[in-house]
C-alpha cells in the first residue's frame, strides 16, 4: 500500500496538470486531493503518467468512491481504465454510450476481455435493455463483444434490433447465447423470402432446433459446412441421411473432411451404414446392416 506522508508546501497540487509526471508515488499520494482528481479527470488522459502513478490515482478514486465511481468520472478514465478489474467495474452504473465508446477505444490492443465484458454488462443493466443504439455501438467499436454478454442479458434484446447484428459479431457466441438469439432472429426475419431468410438466419443457426433444420433441408439452401459444423449436436443427430444431403446440397462432400469431428462424427454413429453408403463419400462408422437400434432412453422414460 502507498505510504502516507505530508505534502511539502512547494508540491501542493491545485490543478491536475502535466507537472505531475515528475512526482514520486508518495508525493502524488500526499499531494493530490481525490476530490480535485475526480473533478479534473478529463485532464488525466492527456498526461503521460507512469503505470505506478496511475496506480496511485486509482487508489485515490477508490478511497473517494468505495461504492463505485460516478459516471462523470468513468467517462474520463482514459488509460486509467486499464487499471480497473472486473470487480471494480461491477460497482459501476453506466448508461451513456459515449462512456462505453471511450472505454472500448482505450481497451483496444490490451488484454481486457473480462473488463470489457463486465463493462458491457453494466451498460445493458444501466440502460435497462440491449437496445439498438447499444448494439450499434458494440458492433462498431467492439466486434465480437456481443458474445461476451450472458444469455440472461441477451434475452433483453428486442427482435427488432437483431437486424443490426452482423455475422462477425456472433463468431465467438457459444451455444447458450445462440439459443437465446436464434428465436429472436427467426421472429425478426420471418417475413423474408427463402434465400434471403437463409442468408440472414445463417449466423444464428447454432441455436436452431431440429425441426427448423429439417425445414431448411426442404428449401434447397445448400448450407455450407462451416455453418453445419456450428449446428447444435442435438439438432443434427435426428436428421436422416437424405435430409442432410438435401440440406448441404453440393457441400455434402465436405462431410468426409469433417468425418472425425462433432457433430458429423456423432451423426454418422446414428446412421445406418447402408444409408451413409448412398452418399458415395466412403463415410465409415454407421450402424451395420441387420442391427436393431434400441433407444433405451425412451424405455427409461416410460418406466
Amino acid at each position: 500500500d502507498v505510504e502516507r506522508t505530508t505534502c511539502p508546501p512547494e508540491k501542493e497540487v491545485h490543478e491536475i496538470d502535466e507537472s505531475l509526471i515528475f512526482y514520486k508515488k508518495r508525493e502524488l499520494e500526499a499531494c493530490v486531493d481525490a476530490a480535485l482528481l475526480a473533478a479534473q479527470m478529463d485532464r488525466v488522459d492527456a498526461i503521460p503518467f507512469t503505470y505506478e502513478q496511475l496506480d496511485v490515482l486509482k487508489h485515490k478514486l477508490d478511497e473517494l468512491y468505495p461504492q463505485g465511481y460516478p459516471e462523470s468520472v468513468i467517462r474520463h478514465l482514459g488509460h486509467l481504465f486499464l487499471k480497473m478489474s472486473p470487480e471494480d467495474i461491477r460497482k459501476w452504473n453506466v448508461t451513456s454510450l459515449e462512456t462505453l465508446k471511450a472505454l472500448l477505444k482505450v481497451s483496444k490492443g490490451h488484454e481486457m476481455s473480462a473488463q470489457v465484458a463486465t463493462l458491457i454488462d453494466r451498460v445493458v443493466v444501466g440502460r435497462g435493455q440491449l437496445d439498438k443504439d447499444t448494439v450499434d455501438t458494440l458492433t462498431a467499436f467492439c466486434p465480437g463483444c456481443l458474445c461476451s454478454l450472458s444469455p440472461e442479458r441477451l434475452s433483453s434484446v428486442p427482435p427488432s434490433v437483431i437486424g443490426a447484428v452482423r455475422p462477425q459479431d456472433l463468431d465467438t457466441c457459444g451455444p447458450r447465447q445462440l439459443d437465446v438469439l436464434y428465436p429472436k432472429a427467426r421472429l425478426a426475419f420471418q417475413n423474408m423470402s427463402g434465400s434471403e431468410y437463409f442468408v440472414k438466419i445463417r449466423p444464428f443457426l447454432g441455436g436452431a432446433p431440429t425441426e427448423d433444420v429439417k425445414a431448411l433441408s426442404q428449401q434447397n439452401v445448400s448450407m455450407d459446412l462451416a455453418t453445419f459444423m456450428k449446428l447444435r449436436r442435438e439438432a443434427v443427430l435426428p436428421l436422416t441421411v437424405a435430409e442432410v444431403q438435401k440440406l448441404l446440397g453440393p457441400h455434402v462432400e465436405g462431410l468426409k473432411v469433417e468425418e472425425q469431428h462433432s457433430p458429423v462424427r456423432d451423426w454418422i454413429l446414428k446412421q445406418r451404414q447402408d444409408d451413409l453408403d448412398t452418399l458415395g463419400l466412403g463415410l465409415q462408422g454407421g450402424i451395420p446392416n441387420g442391427y436393431l437400434i434400441l433407444d433405451l432412453s425412451v424405455r427409461e422414460a416410460l418406466s
Partner: antibody, heavy 120, light 112 residues
Framework: QVQLKESGPGLVAPSQSLSITCTVS????????ISWVRQPPGKGLEWLGV???????NYNSALKSRLSISKDNSKSQVFLKMNSLQTDDTARFYC??????????????WGQGTSVTVSS | DVVMTQTPLSLPVSLGDQASISCRSS???????????LHWYLQKPGQSPKLLIY???NRFSGVPDRFSGSGSGTDFTLKISRVETEDLGVYFC?????????FGSGTKLEIK
Amino acid sequence: QVQLKESGPGLVAPSQSLSITCTVSGFSLSSYAISWVRQPPGKGLEWLGVIWTGGGTNYNSALKSRLSISKDNSKSQVFLKMNSLQTDDTARFYCARNNYGRLDYAMDYWGQGTSVTVSS
Amino acid sequence: DVVMTQTPLSLPVSLGDQASISCRSSQSLVHGNGNTYLHWYLQKPGQSPKLLIYKVSNRFSGVPDRFSGSGSGTDFTLKISRVETEDLGVYFCSQSTHVPFTFGSGTKLEIK
C-alpha cells in the same frame, strides 16, 4: 501565430532584484507551460524554471532560493522575479513554451529574449 | 541534477559533409512512462534557440530531413547528413525527463 515576447529593465544594480514579463499570444497559458532560460554573453543556455498549466513551478536547484515564477492566464503573461543579482547574472533571458502534449515537454517556441546587465 | 555532456565543443566541417554531435547524460533519460525526453536545439548567431528534434528522433515541423536524432538511455547523437551554410550555429541537447530540466554545454558547428 504563436509568439512570446520578453520585456525587462535592461539594467539592474547589484544586489537588486530583477522582474521580467513574458507576454504570449496565439495560445493559452492554461494549455501550455512556460520555461525561463538564460544565456550569459558567449556562454551556453541555463534553464531557470518552469510554470505549469496549473500554476505549479519547478526551479533550477542552484538558483531556487532567488527565483519566483508566476503568471496571469487572463492577461497571457508570465512573470520571472530574481533576487540579489550579481554581475555574473548578466545574461539574455528567454521565455519558451513547453509543449507537453504533442512534443512531450520540449520547448517548441521561444521569445527573442531580453538583455539584462547587472552593473552599478 | 542531470548533467548533460556534449562533445565536441567545436566542430569544424566542410559544406556538404556529414556532422555528428554526441550528448551523454549522467543518468538514464527514460522516464517511468517509457518516453525519453531528450531534445536538440539550434541557436544561430544573433538569434533565439529553435527546436530541431524532440524526444530523441522526431523532427520538429519545418526541420529538413538531413537532420536526424538517435540514441537511448544515456547516449544520444545528432547527425546532419550534408551540412549547409544555414546549419551553422550552436547545437544544444536538453533533457526534460527529470526536473530540474538541464541543457548540454553546446557544440559550435563552423566552417573548416
